[in-house]
């Protein structure tokens, strides 16, 4: 279940947070999602390059997704199929996000309200959006332009793995424990 | 269709205060981001800030702190920005806009602000 | 804050010409750039924003391009309307900055 709004507001960063999406759903391996130089977008066990995103606030509780490297927006098809696409569409690329209790986050398509998953290891022609919503954990990346701050020891704002610290998402959302980078 | 209304223009005393109404129709008014942005005569444009207006929460260009501070009226779809301690740097036309992404994506016709003694 | 500087600050060209129009961001900004119009005594006007994606309503004869620190605004076949001011702005994030603008005019 999606948080309540019961959290003081975090007044810190702008709007644009560099995350790793980590999910370990039952349905596939653990996996960090990326978007990849040719417009495919898969899981791969450890972090890298292409794994590196952008989570952007558009308006409140909607975000895009942008993939560093590749510099592609993470794009859903009607059937639920993901790509990157180096052109945002906000129709494809828009997704409402809803942080859960346990610091996960839901992603589904502002358009067609179906969850974001990552393919299967099957054939890409079957159950490319497998029921259920799939549960993401943001994890922190290097902030884009500023160093890390050297040993910081002193517990972290609980921003977390919300796009947005600013409370910028919808009125009934929650913060997720993946602290901020 | 989407429409932002600001109030006619101001004539104020330096020292003084004004609070510019943006008053937004056509859309749902907490499905997006209001912000302003400041534009002195023959110059271009600088960024105030944005207020979520679901929440109040806002965004602010430190060059304006002190110096603008942003509200919303939820129940009568409204955005202010009051500006205080005016000078004549102040004198401008001050745009409310609607936000996507910081991206600003529908603008009001401005409210010209001109200080002056 | 990321400064905005754009180039040329005002040029002239005839209807039915191509112009370019160019702005450059002192650090990445990856894909978060957008254009506007302003015509003389008007609001500005969102054209593109995500570097390439054209606002509701923008003729196809606007496109963006570029990546990182440089990008550019190109306007194929100008039209006697598309004159006026132009100005790029990032939005990556904030403080959100604009250039200084582009004023172009009818030769």
């Known amino acids: 279940h999606p948080i309540p709004d019961s959290s003081p507001l975090l007044q810190f960063g702008g709007q644009v947070r560099q995350r790793y999406l980590y999910t370990d759903d039952a349905q596939q391996t653990e996996a960090h999602l990326e978007i990849r130089e040719d417009g495919t977008v898969g899981g791969a066990a450890d972090q890298s390059p292409e794994s590196l995103l952008q989570l952007k606030a558009l308006k409140p509780g909607v975000i895009q997704i942008l993939g560093v490297k590749t510099s592609r927006f993470l794009c859903q098809r009607p059937d639920g199929a993901l790509y990157g696409s180096l052109h945002f569409d906000p129709e494809a690329c828009s997704f409402r996000e809803l942080l859960l209790e346990d610091g996960y986050n839901v992603y589904q398509s502002e358009a067609h309200g179906l969850p974001l998953h990552l393919p299967g290891n099957k054939s890409p022609h079957r159950d490319p959006a497998p029921r259920g919503p799939a549960r993401f954990l943001p994890l922190p990346g290097l902030p884009p332009a500023l160093p890390e701050p050297p040993g910081i020891l002193a517990p972290q704002p609980p921003d977390v793995g919300s796009s947005d610290p600013l409370s910028m998402v919808g009125p009934s959302q929650g913060r997720s424990p993946s602290y901020a980078s | 269709e989407v429409q932002l209304q600001q109030s006619g223009p101001e004539l104020v005393k330096p020292g003084a205060s004004v609070k510019i109404p943006c008053k937004a129709s056509?859309?749902?008014?907490?499905?997006?981001?209001m912000g302003w942005v400041k534009q002195s005569h023959g110059k271009s444009l600088e960024w105030i800030g944005d207020?979520?207006?679901?929440?109040?929460?806002?965004i602010n260009n430190q060059n304006f702190k002190g110096k603008a501070t942003l509200t919303v009226d939820k129940s009568s779809s409204t955005a202010y920005m009051e500006l205080r301690s005016l000078a004549s740097e102040d004198t401008a036309v001050y745009y409310c806009?609607?936000?996507?992404?910081?991206?600003?994506?529908?603008w009001g016709q401005g409210t010209s602000v001109t200080v002056s003694s | 804050d990321i400064q905005m500087t754009q180039s040329p600050a005002s040029l002239s060209a005839s209807v039915g010409e191509t112009v370019i129009i160019t702005c450059r961001a002192s650090?990445?900004?990856?894909?978060?750039l957008a254009w506007y119009q302003q015509k003389q005594g008007k609001s500005p006007q969102l054209l593109v924003y995500?570097?390439?994606t054209l606002a509701e309503g923008v003729p196809s004869r606007f496109s963006g391009s570029g990546s990182g620190t440089q990008f550019s605004l190109k306007i194929n076949s100008l039209q006697p309307e598309d004159f006026g001011s132009y100005y790029c702005?990032?939005?990556?994030?904030?403080?959100?900055?604009f250039g200084g603008g582009t004023k172009l005019e009818i030769k």
């Open positions: 056509g859309y749902t008014f907490t499905d997006y981001y």
């Open positions: 806009t609607r936000g996507y992404g910081g991206a600003l994506d529908y």
């Open positions: 702005q990032h939005h990556y994030d904030s403080p959100w900055t």
């Open positions: 207020i979520n207006p679901n929440n109040g929460v806002t």
């Open positions: 650090e990445n900004i990856y894909s978060y």
């Open positions: 995500n570097i390439r």
